[in-house]
Protein backbone atom coordinates (compact mmCIF):
# COMPACT_ATOMS: atom_id res chain seq x y z
CA UNK A 1 0.00 0.00 0.00
CA UNK A 2 3.29 2.32 -0.30
CA UNK A 3 2.18 6.03 -2.11
CA UNK A 4 3.63 6.23 -5.72
CA UNK A 5 4.80 9.74 -6.84
CA UNK A 6 5.65 10.77 -10.22
CA UNK A 7 6.88 13.94 -11.55
CA UNK A 8 8.80 14.28 -14.67
CA UNK A 9 12.58 13.66 -15.52
CA UNK A 10 13.81 17.10 -16.57
CA UNK A 11 12.41 20.68 -16.70
CA UNK A 12 13.99 23.38 -18.10
CA UNK A 13 13.69 26.79 -16.29
CA UNK A 14 12.97 29.93 -18.15
CA UNK A 15 15.27 32.98 -19.12
CA UNK A 16 13.30 34.47 -16.11
CA UNK A 17 14.67 32.06 -13.82
CA UNK A 18 11.25 30.06 -13.63
CA UNK A 19 10.53 26.44 -13.36
CA UNK A 20 7.28 24.46 -13.54
CA UNK A 21 6.14 20.97 -12.95
CA UNK A 22 3.56 18.60 -12.16
CA UNK A 23 3.85 16.38 -9.35
CA UNK A 24 1.01 13.50 -9.16
CA UNK A 25 0.45 11.03 -6.51
CA UNK A 26 -1.47 7.72 -6.38
CA UNK A 27 -3.60 8.09 -3.10
CA UNK A 28 -3.89 4.48 -1.13
CA UNK A 29 -6.54 6.24 0.63
CA UNK A 30 -8.96 9.54 0.84
CA UNK A 31 -6.92 12.05 2.09
CA UNK A 32 -8.59 15.41 3.29
CA UNK A 33 -5.19 16.97 4.68
CA UNK A 34 -2.29 16.71 1.98
CA UNK A 35 1.42 18.45 2.83
CA UNK A 36 3.35 18.78 -0.58
CA UNK A 37 7.41 19.49 -0.10
CA UNK A 38 9.80 19.95 -2.79
CA UNK A 39 13.17 19.04 -1.79
CA UNK A 40 16.84 19.73 -3.52
CA UNK A 41 19.09 16.93 -3.21
CA UNK A 42 22.68 17.90 -4.12
CA UNK A 43 25.59 15.26 -3.80
CA UNK A 44 23.98 13.02 -0.83
CA UNK A 45 22.81 16.28 0.67
CA UNK A 46 18.84 17.34 1.12
CA UNK A 47 17.41 20.06 1.86
CA UNK A 48 13.72 21.68 1.82
CA UNK A 49 12.76 24.09 -0.96
CA UNK A 50 9.52 25.01 0.19
CA UNK A 51 6.29 23.18 1.66
CA UNK A 52 2.94 23.64 1.79
CA UNK A 53 -0.03 21.88 3.73
CA UNK A 54 -3.51 22.20 2.05
CA UNK A 55 -6.89 20.62 2.77
CA UNK A 56 -8.33 18.74 -0.69
CA UNK A 57 -10.65 20.93 -2.67
CA UNK A 58 -8.47 24.21 -1.42
CA UNK A 59 -5.45 25.87 -2.98
CA UNK A 60 -2.11 25.47 -1.87
CA UNK A 61 -0.72 28.07 -0.15
CA UNK A 62 2.77 28.53 0.54
CA UNK A 63 4.77 30.83 2.78
CA UNK A 64 4.47 34.88 1.89
CA UNK A 65 8.30 34.15 1.89
CA UNK A 66 8.79 31.01 -0.43
CA UNK A 67 10.33 30.79 -3.73
CA UNK A 68 7.61 28.33 -4.81
CA UNK A 69 3.68 28.65 -5.73
CA UNK A 70 1.08 26.16 -6.75
CA UNK A 71 -2.50 24.75 -7.14
CA UNK A 72 -3.78 21.42 -6.85
CA UNK A 73 -6.20 19.44 -8.71
CA UNK A 74 -6.95 15.71 -7.25
CA UNK A 75 -4.07 14.16 -6.67
CA UNK A 76 -2.25 16.51 -9.18
CA UNK A 77 -0.21 19.84 -7.68
CA UNK A 78 1.24 22.11 -10.42
CA UNK A 79 4.60 23.50 -8.49
CA UNK A 80 6.00 26.75 -10.07
CA UNK A 81 9.78 28.02 -8.22
CA UNK A 82 10.94 31.26 -9.14
CA UNK A 83 14.02 32.80 -8.67
CA UNK A 84 15.96 30.57 -9.89
CA UNK A 85 19.86 31.08 -10.83
CA UNK A 86 22.41 28.21 -12.58
CA UNK A 87 23.76 27.30 -9.32
CA UNK A 88 20.39 26.21 -8.14
CA UNK A 89 20.94 23.50 -10.94
CA UNK A 90 20.00 19.88 -9.66
CA UNK A 91 17.15 17.04 -8.63
CA UNK A 92 14.44 18.64 -7.21
CA UNK A 93 12.03 15.97 -5.47
CA UNK A 94 8.93 16.13 -4.64
CA UNK A 95 7.70 14.77 -1.73
CA UNK A 96 3.89 14.35 -0.89
CA UNK A 97 2.54 13.21 2.61
CA UNK A 98 -1.18 12.36 3.88
CA UNK A 99 -1.73 14.06 6.84
CA UNK A 100 -5.12 13.09 7.75
CA UNK A 101 -7.19 11.26 8.36
CA UNK A 102 -5.44 8.27 9.09
CA UNK A 103 -3.46 6.36 8.08
CA UNK A 104 -0.19 8.40 7.62
CA UNK A 105 1.44 7.78 4.19
CA UNK A 106 4.50 9.23 2.58
CA UNK A 107 5.50 9.19 -0.91
CA UNK A 108 8.55 10.35 -2.38
CA UNK A 109 8.85 11.29 -6.33
CA UNK A 110 12.19 9.88 -8.12
CA UNK A 111 12.79 13.99 -8.74
CA UNK A 112 13.07 16.61 -11.18
CA UNK A 113 16.28 17.61 -13.20
CA UNK A 114 16.19 21.53 -13.03
CA UNK A 115 18.22 23.11 -15.59
CA UNK A 116 19.19 26.52 -15.27
CA UNK A 117 20.96 28.98 -17.33
CA UNK A 118 21.15 32.27 -16.45
CA UNK A 119 20.56 35.07 -19.33
CA UNK A 120 23.52 36.85 -21.20
CA UNK A 121 23.98 40.16 -20.24
CA UNK A 122 22.33 42.57 -23.62
CA UNK A 123 25.29 43.87 -25.02
CA UNK A 124 26.42 47.72 -24.74
CA UNK A 125 24.57 49.25 -27.68
CA UNK A 126 26.26 52.13 -29.13
CA UNK B 1 25.36 20.53 15.80
CA UNK B 2 22.04 18.88 15.13
CA UNK B 3 20.89 17.49 18.67
CA UNK B 4 18.27 16.11 20.64
CA UNK B 5 18.71 15.61 24.16
CA UNK B 6 16.10 13.90 26.24
CA UNK B 7 14.71 14.29 30.00
CA UNK B 8 12.31 13.43 32.51
CA UNK B 9 12.68 9.27 32.75
CA UNK B 10 12.73 7.44 36.46
CA UNK B 11 10.71 5.58 38.51
CA UNK B 12 7.21 5.32 38.93
CA UNK B 13 4.53 3.45 40.83
CA UNK B 14 1.75 1.92 37.77
CA UNK B 15 -0.94 4.35 37.27
CA UNK B 16 0.92 6.78 37.65
CA UNK B 17 2.18 9.50 35.38
CA UNK B 18 5.52 11.23 33.93
CA UNK B 19 6.54 14.04 31.52
CA UNK B 20 9.38 13.83 29.27
CA UNK B 21 10.92 16.44 27.28
CA UNK B 22 13.05 16.35 24.23
CA UNK B 23 15.36 19.16 23.59
CA UNK B 24 16.41 19.67 19.85
CA UNK B 25 18.81 22.35 18.48
CA UNK B 26 20.64 22.54 15.15
CA UNK B 27 17.97 22.36 13.18
CA UNK B 28 14.98 23.82 12.34
CA UNK B 29 12.77 22.12 14.79
CA UNK B 30 9.29 23.15 13.45
CA UNK B 31 9.92 22.33 9.59
CA UNK B 32 10.42 18.00 10.97
CA UNK B 33 7.71 15.37 12.36
CA UNK B 34 9.36 14.03 15.92
CA UNK B 35 8.62 10.52 17.09
CA UNK B 36 8.89 8.88 20.26
CA UNK B 37 10.43 5.06 20.22
CA UNK B 38 10.74 2.85 23.39
CA UNK B 39 13.28 -0.11 23.67
CA UNK B 40 12.19 -2.48 26.93
CA UNK B 41 15.17 -3.91 28.58
CA UNK B 42 16.38 -6.63 26.48
CA UNK B 43 14.20 -6.38 23.22
CA UNK B 44 13.70 -4.71 19.80
CA UNK B 45 12.39 -1.33 18.30
CA UNK B 46 9.13 -0.02 19.31
CA UNK B 47 7.51 2.84 18.02
CA UNK B 48 5.37 5.09 20.06
CA UNK B 49 4.30 8.58 19.03
CA UNK B 50 4.68 10.79 16.20
CA UNK B 51 3.59 14.87 15.97
CA UNK B 52 4.24 16.66 12.57
CA UNK B 53 5.11 20.28 12.07
CA UNK B 54 2.91 23.01 13.38
CA UNK B 55 1.67 20.10 15.98
CA UNK B 56 -1.74 19.40 14.66
CA UNK B 57 -1.52 15.90 13.46
CA UNK B 58 -0.25 12.97 15.70
CA UNK B 59 -0.30 9.63 15.41
CA UNK B 60 0.02 6.80 18.54
CA UNK B 61 0.86 3.80 18.24
CA UNK B 62 -2.28 0.82 19.84
CA UNK B 63 -0.40 0.09 23.27
CA UNK B 64 -0.35 3.63 23.85
CA UNK B 65 -3.44 5.33 22.36
CA UNK B 66 -6.02 6.97 25.02
CA UNK B 67 -2.89 6.78 27.97
CA UNK B 68 -0.26 8.81 26.18
CA UNK B 69 0.01 12.71 24.73
CA UNK B 70 2.58 13.97 22.20
CA UNK B 71 2.95 17.41 21.93
CA UNK B 72 5.53 20.23 20.42
CA UNK B 73 6.51 23.90 21.48
CA UNK B 74 8.19 24.80 18.43
CA UNK B 75 8.91 28.52 20.22
CA UNK B 76 10.89 26.06 22.52
CA UNK B 77 12.71 23.46 20.05
CA UNK B 78 11.12 20.90 22.44
CA UNK B 79 9.20 17.86 22.05
CA UNK B 80 6.79 16.33 24.66
CA UNK B 81 5.32 12.91 25.90
CA UNK B 82 2.81 13.06 28.64
CA UNK B 83 2.94 9.51 29.98
CA UNK B 84 -0.45 8.60 32.41
CA UNK B 85 -1.80 5.61 33.47
CA UNK B 86 1.48 3.68 33.30
CA UNK B 87 1.79 0.11 33.46
CA UNK B 88 4.51 -2.19 33.91
CA UNK B 89 4.93 -3.31 29.97
CA UNK B 90 5.98 0.53 29.64
CA UNK B 91 9.23 0.08 30.69
CA UNK B 92 11.54 0.95 28.72
CA UNK B 93 14.48 3.42 27.45
CA UNK B 94 12.44 6.15 25.63
CA UNK B 95 14.02 7.57 22.53
CA UNK B 96 13.18 10.83 20.63
CA UNK B 97 13.95 10.64 17.20
CA UNK B 98 13.65 13.15 13.82
CA UNK B 99 12.13 11.89 11.09
CA UNK B 100 14.14 13.14 7.89
CA UNK B 101 13.64 14.96 5.42
CA UNK B 102 13.18 11.77 3.42
CA UNK B 103 11.22 10.04 5.64
CA UNK B 104 13.90 7.71 7.78
CA UNK B 105 14.71 8.68 11.54
CA UNK B 106 18.15 10.25 10.90
CA UNK B 107 18.93 11.44 14.62
CA UNK B 108 17.93 10.28 18.16
CA UNK B 109 18.18 11.36 21.47
CA UNK B 110 20.58 9.44 24.18
CA UNK B 111 17.47 7.87 25.65
CA UNK B 112 16.03 8.44 28.60
CA UNK B 113 15.38 4.99 31.22
CA UNK B 114 11.26 4.96 32.82
CA UNK B 115 10.95 2.18 34.99
CA UNK B 116 7.61 1.35 36.32
CA UNK B 117 7.19 -0.46 39.69
CA UNK B 118 5.55 -0.86 42.48
CA UNK C 1 -0.03 -3.17 9.61
CA UNK C 2 3.34 -4.41 8.06
CA UNK C 3 5.23 -6.94 10.18
CA UNK C 4 9.30 -6.86 9.39
CA UNK C 5 10.83 -10.32 10.01
CA UNK C 6 14.96 -10.14 10.65
CA UNK C 7 16.82 -13.48 9.96
CA UNK C 8 18.98 -14.60 11.73
CA UNK C 9 18.43 -13.87 15.06
CA UNK C 10 22.18 -14.11 15.61
CA UNK C 11 25.39 -14.42 13.07
CA UNK C 12 28.91 -15.48 14.87
CA UNK C 13 31.32 -14.13 11.98
CA UNK C 14 34.83 -13.13 12.72
CA UNK C 15 36.29 -9.58 11.90
CA UNK C 16 37.26 -8.91 8.40
CA UNK C 17 34.46 -11.53 7.35
CA UNK C 18 31.53 -10.93 5.17
CA UNK C 19 27.65 -10.39 7.04
CA UNK C 20 24.61 -10.88 5.20
CA UNK C 21 20.68 -9.42 7.08
CA UNK C 22 18.07 -10.37 5.98
CA UNK C 23 14.39 -8.85 6.25
CA UNK C 24 10.94 -9.88 4.96
CA UNK C 25 7.68 -7.87 4.97
CA UNK C 26 4.18 -9.26 5.44
CA UNK C 27 3.60 -7.08 2.42
CA UNK C 28 5.15 -5.27 -0.38
CA UNK C 29 7.07 -2.13 1.11
CA UNK C 30 8.58 0.76 -1.54
CA UNK C 31 12.39 0.42 -1.67
CA UNK C 32 11.90 3.81 -0.59
CA UNK C 33 10.83 3.29 2.69
CA UNK C 34 12.81 0.85 4.23
CA UNK C 35 15.91 1.65 6.32
CA UNK C 36 18.55 -0.07 8.17
CA UNK C 37 19.86 0.98 11.97
CA UNK C 38 22.81 0.04 13.75
CA UNK C 39 22.73 0.12 17.49
CA UNK C 40 25.47 -0.61 20.56
CA UNK C 41 25.38 -1.54 24.08
CA UNK C 42 24.10 1.49 25.72
CA UNK C 43 23.66 3.51 22.91
CA UNK C 44 20.29 5.13 20.75
CA UNK C 45 19.88 3.33 17.32
CA UNK C 46 22.17 5.56 14.29
CA UNK C 47 20.91 5.14 10.99
CA UNK C 48 23.15 3.50 8.32
CA UNK C 49 20.26 2.84 5.09
CA UNK C 50 17.34 4.62 3.92
CA UNK C 51 15.70 4.13 0.30
CA UNK C 52 16.95 0.15 0.86
CA UNK C 53 20.21 0.93 -0.76
CA UNK C 54 21.37 4.80 -0.06
CA UNK C 55 24.04 4.92 2.85
CA UNK C 56 23.34 7.93 5.16
CA UNK C 57 25.76 10.60 6.03
CA UNK C 58 29.10 9.36 7.33
CA UNK C 59 28.30 5.34 6.73
CA UNK C 60 31.17 3.59 5.55
CA UNK C 61 30.96 2.13 1.87
CA UNK C 62 31.25 -1.31 3.50
CA UNK C 63 28.09 -1.26 4.08
CA UNK C 64 25.48 -1.82 1.70
CA UNK C 65 21.71 -2.40 1.60
CA UNK C 66 19.67 -4.49 -1.37
CA UNK C 67 16.09 -5.34 -2.12
CA UNK C 68 12.52 -4.78 -2.88
CA UNK C 69 9.05 -5.68 -2.32
CA UNK C 70 8.85 -7.97 0.96
CA UNK C 71 12.64 -9.07 0.71
CA UNK C 72 15.71 -6.90 1.39
CA UNK C 73 19.33 -7.33 2.71
CA UNK C 74 22.15 -5.47 4.52
CA UNK C 75 25.36 -6.54 3.88
CA UNK C 76 28.88 -5.53 5.57
CA UNK C 77 31.46 -6.35 2.98
CA UNK C 78 34.26 -6.77 5.66
CA UNK C 79 33.28 -6.28 9.27
CA UNK C 80 35.59 -4.40 11.54
CA UNK C 81 35.83 -4.64 15.11
CA UNK C 82 33.03 -1.60 15.98
CA UNK C 83 30.60 -3.43 13.72
CA UNK C 84 29.83 -6.09 15.96
CA UNK C 85 26.60 -4.78 17.48
CA UNK C 86 22.30 -5.26 16.81
CA UNK C 87 20.96 -4.32 13.52
CA UNK C 88 17.21 -3.36 12.68
CA UNK C 89 15.23 -2.96 9.57
CA UNK C 90 12.51 0.03 9.98
CA UNK C 91 9.15 0.37 6.97
CA UNK C 92 8.54 4.65 7.33
CA UNK C 93 6.33 4.48 4.41
CA UNK C 94 3.18 4.48 6.02
CA UNK C 95 1.71 3.95 9.73
CA UNK C 96 2.37 2.69 11.84
CA UNK C 97 6.43 2.20 11.65
CA UNK C 98 7.26 -0.58 12.57
CA UNK C 99 10.65 -2.59 13.10
CA UNK C 100 11.74 -5.92 12.78
CA UNK C 101 12.97 -7.86 15.93
CA UNK C 102 16.58 -7.32 15.20
CA UNK C 103 19.50 -9.21 13.96
CA UNK C 104 22.54 -9.23 16.50
CA UNK C 105 26.07 -9.86 14.51
CA UNK C 106 28.66 -10.87 17.68
CA UNK C 107 32.17 -11.96 17.13
CA UNK C 108 32.85 -15.82 16.70
Known amino acids: KAMHVAQPAVVLANSRGTASFVCEYASPGKATEVRVTVLRQADSQVTEVCAATYMMGNELTFLDDSICTGTSSGNQVNLTIQGLRAMDTGLYICKVELMYPPPYYMGIGNGTQIYVIDPEPCPDSD | QVQLVESGGGVVQPGRSLRLSCAASGFTFSSYGMHWVRQAPGTGLEWVAVIWYEGRNKYYADPVKGRFTISRDNSKNTLYLQMNSLRDDDTAVYYC???????????WGQGTMVTVSS | EIVLTQSPGTLSLSPGERATLSCRAS???????LAWYQQKPGQAPRLLIY???SRATGIPDRFSGSGSGTDFTLTISRLEPEDFAVYYCQQYGSSPWTSGQGTKVEIK
Open chain 2, 97 to 107: ARAGDLGAFDI
Open chain 3, 51 to 53: GAS
Open chain 3, 27 to 33: QSVSSSY
